[in-house]
């Protein structure tokens, strides 16, 4: 792939299959549109980054709550 199409930040190979505890999640970001699949990356209190499926309702709910805060 040409350098111009490189993803500038993290991408996700796949998604977590478990719903994260709401109080574990402190921040989020959406991966670049240059990644091969869309993803939301949640950052946890322990500093871990967790790839999640943006089409899942719990993911959308958490994103909404984080935006409110």
């Amino acid at each position: 792939a040409p350098m111009g199409s490189d993803p500038p930040t993290a991408c996700c190979f796949s998604y977590t299959a478990r719903k994260l505890p709401h109080n574990f999640v402190v921040d989020y970001y959406e991966t670049s549109s240059l990644c091969s699949q869309p993803a939301v990356v949640f950052q946890t209190k322990r500093g871990k980054q967790v790839c999640a499926d943006p089409s899942e309702s719990w993911v959308q709910e958490y994103v909404y709550d984080l935006e409110l805060n």
Partner: antibody
């Protein structure tokens, strides 16, 4: 702590199938993928495939027709099945943990491997 | 399927800097290949060192660093130690599968 352990038959007759189990501890299969990799005697590594938390898989295209990866999250076990074994499938077979994000090491923790010899 | 090529063997001395490289026959290695480096020590002990081209795994010494140099991925050991003697494998991601290089046997003459 994170641990992975492979268990297999050791010896397999030509044309028969191979089943290997990877039992993990210290993390959940709902949060990580599991990769399978093999190493023939005195040679390099060959990636076989991966199963992701939701059960989706990717395979080495050269082996896809003979390969199947499945898992049981509740038992923390992942299963590799390979059909129609030949002598050049003789190798050490490893499972490795696969984080989901591309900025981490993609096969970070490895099992100690299980030796498979294909011979009559 | 892509072919990934590494130096078969390199020799260095303690305290020296050594660079191992990883080439793809499909063209330049880019950040989209998420180059990984894995260390093999005797008795089949494998450890993931570097992921996503340049991200060190937790606990990996800072002397190990990953980068792109020209059209290749690279692993640089700055101030090699005798315990770094091992075989190093790179792995490149091609959209839906990984391909390993043949490995570089690094000897640290001490």
């Amino acid at each position: 702590q994170v641990q992975l352990k492979e268990s297999g038959p050791g010896l397999v007759a030509p044309s028969q199938s191979l089943s290997i189990t990877c039992t993990v501890s210290g993390f959940s299969l709902t949060g990580y993928g599991i990769h399978w990799v093999r190493q023939p005697p005195g040679k390099g590594l060959e990636w076989l495939g991966v199963i992701w938390p939701g059960g989706g898989t990717n395979y080495n295209s050269a082996l896809m027709s003979r390969l199947s990866i499945s898992k049981d999250n509740s038992k923390s076990q992942v299963f590799l099945k390979m059909n129609s074994l030949q002598t050049d499938d003789t190798a050490m077979y490893y499972c490795a943990r696969g984080p989901l994000i591309t900025t981490e090491v993609s096969m970070d923790y490895w099992g100690q491997g299980t030796s498979v010899t294909v011979s009559s | 399927q892509a072919v990934v090529t590494q130096e078969s063997a390199l020799t260095t001395s303690p305290g020296e800097t050594v660079t191992l490289t990883c080439r793809s026959n499909t063209g330049a290695v880019t950040t989209s290949n998420y180059a990984n480096w894995v260390q093999e020590k005797p008795d089949h002990l494998f450890t993931g060192l570097i992921g996503g081209t340049n991200n060190r795994a937790p606990g990996v010494p800072a002397r190990f660093s990953g980068s792109l140099i020209g059209d290749k991925a690279a692993l640089t050991i700055t101030g090699a130690q005798t315990e770094d003697e091992a075989i190093y494998f790179c792995a490149l991601w091609y959209s839906n599968h990984w391909v390993f290089g043949g490995g570089t046997k690094l000897t640290v003459l001490g």
